[in-house]
């Protein structure tokens, strides 16, 4: 069966029907359907006016305008808001009421595209394998990134979050139109990785998406990750304004000037330094989402009630921090270079700057405890990776899972740890699953390009597609049309259970309490440390080119996690079980919840980089030479050669780009207040809203207030002798 021309709100569209095998199955593929009008710089997206005739939707459209990997030129286009759809078809009747999975790509909110990195015409985010193996509709789309997607003055002049609003427009378009493609508009699952995983999380929390999203999957990124929310957008807006010659004294004049500046100049005015960093990449974040008082009405920690009815999977890769650690400390990947205590202490102190000397020392002591028994370089390097994995990914993800669980009514919560090791041969053997290593398996690359992979990789891919698509169908990763290797139990605050995804999965893959002593440390001990306000605690921006200037964390405001407001439904921290490692006793009378103990976490794998972040797909054959990086719009990472290649594959370049950089410190600029009176829902903006906003929980524009004794969210009674406590909002470093 095949769809032929499909009528959408914009008009008729015609894709391509691709036959699969000899049994008559096929997949209808639509590429390049507009879901919004061509964008205007630094303006909200607007609906597409439509077209006459039948639109031929047969080729991917250009990505949104962004800097190339070398950051000296741009590629892509301002006219970029297009989506792509894969619809599986059986032999006889056209598909109906299929679950819908919408992918949101990562790339540090700075780069990426809906089709992903390309090698030999194989696009990373090609939805065919997921669609046909899982019998679901897959949708991918472009959204604006970098300054054009996220520049903000922190007020109504340039509220920001344009890229998030693009994402929302795509979701709302799918809701209105997917039935015509055979999809069930009442069963939409968002999934995404890194900045895409954080975007998924933010979309579930935004009042604009009420009623649009049924389920969500965040891979290596959640709204609470420290690199997701920019607390000082005005600082970065001024940096760009200075670069392009706009006045910075008056925000309104600056905004008007920026809107009429060449978008390419705006894009190139922000560069992420990738070498010789004076501070961790964390401090160089520029253009990411903001709390605008409208689309993101309050700190994400206070918005979890908005996601209470959405089934949720969240997880990380066991060495998600590897790529970042190797940028912050290049010795990590060099066998002949050593990591010293001084190096690590310096790194720790830069991450814990707002807690001053005590923060650095305590954190250093906790992480180096194993160094006395095992002073090997491998152990030290793993420690650095674990530290960045914890801070940037694991701890925020655990808090997000606990928040979701505590607010959820009938909705389910599931946690995972992806531990299938990286296939990048240039990495040391101890490296586990790096950032973005999971993507290739979710998108079925071991099946799409089988010569580049081993049977064990296909085992992992088959399992992930089965869990992900079952979840999209039923809300339970175990139930659906696809067999799974072992039962994945829901995450609860009692068990803190997570599934470890490896090549050999069985009943022992269900584990509990991941890295509890470290989770406990961050949410209890570290939080309770006093925040320092003296000048020494503030990093001095490096001199030289402004693009390398980190935002100094300011004062003590918001650096420590703030407990959620009264009825935010902030969950208590899951009680700990019998953790293998003794929890670090909290200092002081911390209001933060105890963290569950870790189980037997296993060594984490490391993911590849790339627009996708996904690991490169190896070329077929046993190439004797390293693959040449692809050219063109793809910017995709090359694929490592298979077989007994004489040379190691070239590490992926292209739109992999820098990993997402977490924002630091607190914003000097207040969030844009919601329109109307804060208890009421924000007034729906004209044009792009697409969904009536739900009133933000709590006092939207204002900083969260610590809950009072009779907070309506009753904490779950902790087990053992842990103190009853509220989960912290977000750990700010």
């Amino acid at each position: 069966a095949k769809l032929g021309a499909v009528y959408t709100e914009g008009g008729f569209v015609e894709g391509v029907n691709k036959k699969l095998g000899l049994l008559g199955d096929s997949v209808d593929i639509f590429k390049g359907i507009p879901f919004a009008a061509p964008t205007k710089a630094l303006e909200n997206p607007q609906p597409h006016p439509g077209w006459q005739g039948t639109l031929k939707a047969k080729n991917f459209k250009k990505r949104c305008l962004q800097a190339t990997i070398t950051q000296d030129s741009t590629y892509g286009d301002e006219d970029c808001l297009y989506l792509n759809i894969w619809v599986p078809q059986g032999r006889k009747q056209v598909s109906r009421d299929l679950p819908v999975m919408i992918w949101i790509y990562g790339g540090a909110f700075l780069m990426g595209s809906g089709h992903g990195a390309n090698f030999l015409n194989n696009y990373l985010y090609d939805g065919e394998e997921i669609a046909t193996r899982g019998n679901v509709i897959v949708v991918t789309f472009n959204y604006r990134v970098g300054p054009l997607g996220f520049l903000s003055t922190g007020d109504a002049n340039l509220p920001g979050n344009y890229g998030l609003r693009d994402q929302h427009m795509a979701i709302a378009w799918v809701k209105r139109n997917i039935a015509a493609f055979g999809g069930d508009p009442n069963n939409i699952t968002l999934f995404g990785e890194s900045a895409g995983g954080a975007s998924v999380s933010l979309q579930t929390l935004s009042p604009y998406n009420k009623g649009l999203i049924r389920r969500a999957i965040s891979q290596s990124g959640v709204a609470l990750s420290p690199w997701v929310i920019q607390k000082n957008p005005l600082f970065w807006a001024k940096k760009v304004a200075e670069k392009v010659g706009c006045p910075v004294g008056d925000a309104a004049r600056m905004a008007q000037c920026l809107k009429v500046t060449d978008p390419r100049a705006l894009t190139l005015a922000y560069k992420v330094p990738l070498a010789g960093l004076e501070y961790p990449m964390l401090h160089y974040v520029g253009f990411v989402p903001v709390i605008d008082g409208d689309f993101i009405p309050a700190d994400p920690i206070n918005l979890y009630a908005n996601a209470a009815d959405i089934d949720y999977i969240a997880g990380t890769n066991n060495m998600d921090g590897h790529i970042f650690a190797s940028i912050d400390m290049p010795a990590i990947n060099k066998g002949n270079k050593k990591v010293t205590e001084e190096d690590f202490y310096k790194l720790v102190s830069e991450f814990t700057i707002t807690k001053g000397l005590r923060g650095a020392k305590t954190t250093f002591d906790v992480y180096t405890e194993s160094w006395a028994q095992d002073p090997s370089q491998e152990n030290k390097k793993k420690t650095v990776v674990d530290f960045e994995t914890d801070v940037l990914f694991l701890v925020p993800t655990e808090i997000a899972l606990a928040q979701h669980r505590a607010n959820a009514k009938s909705a389910k919560t599931y946690a995972y740890l992806f531990s299938h090791p990286s296939r990048m041969p240039v990495y040391p053997k101890w490296v586990g699953a790096d950032h973005a290593d999971d993507i290739q398996y979710v998108f079925g690359k071991p099946f799409a390009t089988p010569t580049g992979y081993r049977p064990q990789d296909r085992t992992v891919s088959k399992a992930m597609i089965a869990y992900w698509t079952n979840f999209a169908k039923t809300g339970d990763p175990n139930m659906g049309d696809s067999a799974v290797p072992t039962h994945w139990e829901p995450y609860t605050t009692e068990n803190s259970g997570y599934l470890e995804i490896t090549k050999k999965m069985g009943s022992s893959s269900m584990k509990r309490s991941l890295r509890t002593n470290f989770l406990r440390y961050w949410t209890l001990t570290y939080l309770a440390l006093p925040t320092v306000t003296d000048q020494e605690a503030t990093p001095v921006p490096p001199t030289g080119d402004s693009e390398a200037t980190p935002v100094p964390p300011t004062g003590d405001s918001e650096t420590a996690p703030v407990p959620p407001t009264g009825d935010s439904g902030a969950p208590p921290v899951p009680p700990t079980g019998d953790s293998g490692a003794p929890p670090v006793p909290p200092t002081g009378d911390s209001g933060a919840p105890p963290v569950p103990p870790t189980g037997d976490s296993g060594a984490p794998p490391v993911p590849p980089t790339g627009d996708s972040g996904a690991p490169p797909v190896p070329p077929t054959g046993d190439s004797g030479a390293p693959p040449v990086p692809p050219t063109g719009d793809s910017g995709a990472p090359p694929v490592p050669p298979t077989g007994d290649s004489g040379a190691p594959p070239v590490p992926p370049t292209g739109d992999a780009g820098p990993p997402p950089v977490p924002p630091t410190g607190d914003s000097g600029a207040p969030p844009v207040p919601p329109t109307g009176d804060s208890g009421a829902p924000p007034v729906t903006p004209t044009g792009d809203s697409e969904t009536a906003p739900v009133p933000p929980t709590g006092d939207s524009g204002a900083p969260p207030v610590p809950p009072t004794g009779d907070s309506e969210a009753a904490p779950v009674p902790p087990t053992d002798d842990s103190k009853e406590a509220q989960m912290p909002a977000v750990i700010r470093f």
Epitope: Y7, P47, Q52, W173
Partner: antibody
Framework: QVQLVQSGAEVKKPGASVKVSCKAS????????MHWVRQAPGQGLEWMGV????????SYAQKFKGRVTMTRDTSTSTVYMELSSLRSEDTAVYYC????????????WGQGTLVTVSS | DIQMTQSPSSLSASVGDRVTITCRAS?????LNWYQQKPGKAPKLLIY???RLPSGVPSRFSGSGSGTDFTLTISSLQPEDFATYYC????????FGQGTKLEIK
Amino acid sequence: QVQLVQSGAEVKKPGASVKVSCKASGYTFTSYNMHWVRQAPGQGLEWMGVINPGDGATSYAQKFKGRVTMTRDTSTSTVYMELSSLRSEDTAVYYCARDYYGSSPLGYWGQGTLVTVSS
Amino acid sequence: DIQMTQSPSSLSASVGDRVTITCRASPSISYLNWYQQKPGKAPKLLIYATSRLPSGVPSRFSGSGSGTDFTLTISSLQPEDFATYYCQQRSSSPTFGQGTKLEIK
């Protein structure tokens, strides 16, 4: 100027079929989608489906799938709507309407064709 | 299908009055169109894309809204404005509101 002229009123028995025509003039026939909308006596408007006269692509409202067929004849700039298995509740005025621009604002309407289904 | 709910279903007003008709969509929509229909006649496009007026439509008609809530406003009623008004959403399966009959008081 744009004109849409529909065929005359019809009286049909239950179970029969009716075919209503809509002749377009004053514009390039193949450049704009044509929709069919009906209105039962004293009731509101109900969208039935759309045809692209350029390539003949059609889309029908779920309610009418299996009973309605829309076709076009580019040589005479005419679109047709055939509704089968008629029942008394199909008694209505049937309108053809052309897109105004872009998609779906129905900017130009035929005068309507009354179809009465009665035994 | 997307549901469109118009209110009021009927209203009485006098020449010169300012009149507002609302249309609520569930779930949210991108654009809304408004039509005017007089007895025995075909509907006429009044406003498209939420707020735009086709040529020939008097400027006393205006439209606004986004997401789920939309309004049609007639700033100063004229005798020829007494008619039935319909809203319509565009999606892959367009639907109309049930209509608002505007009568002379």
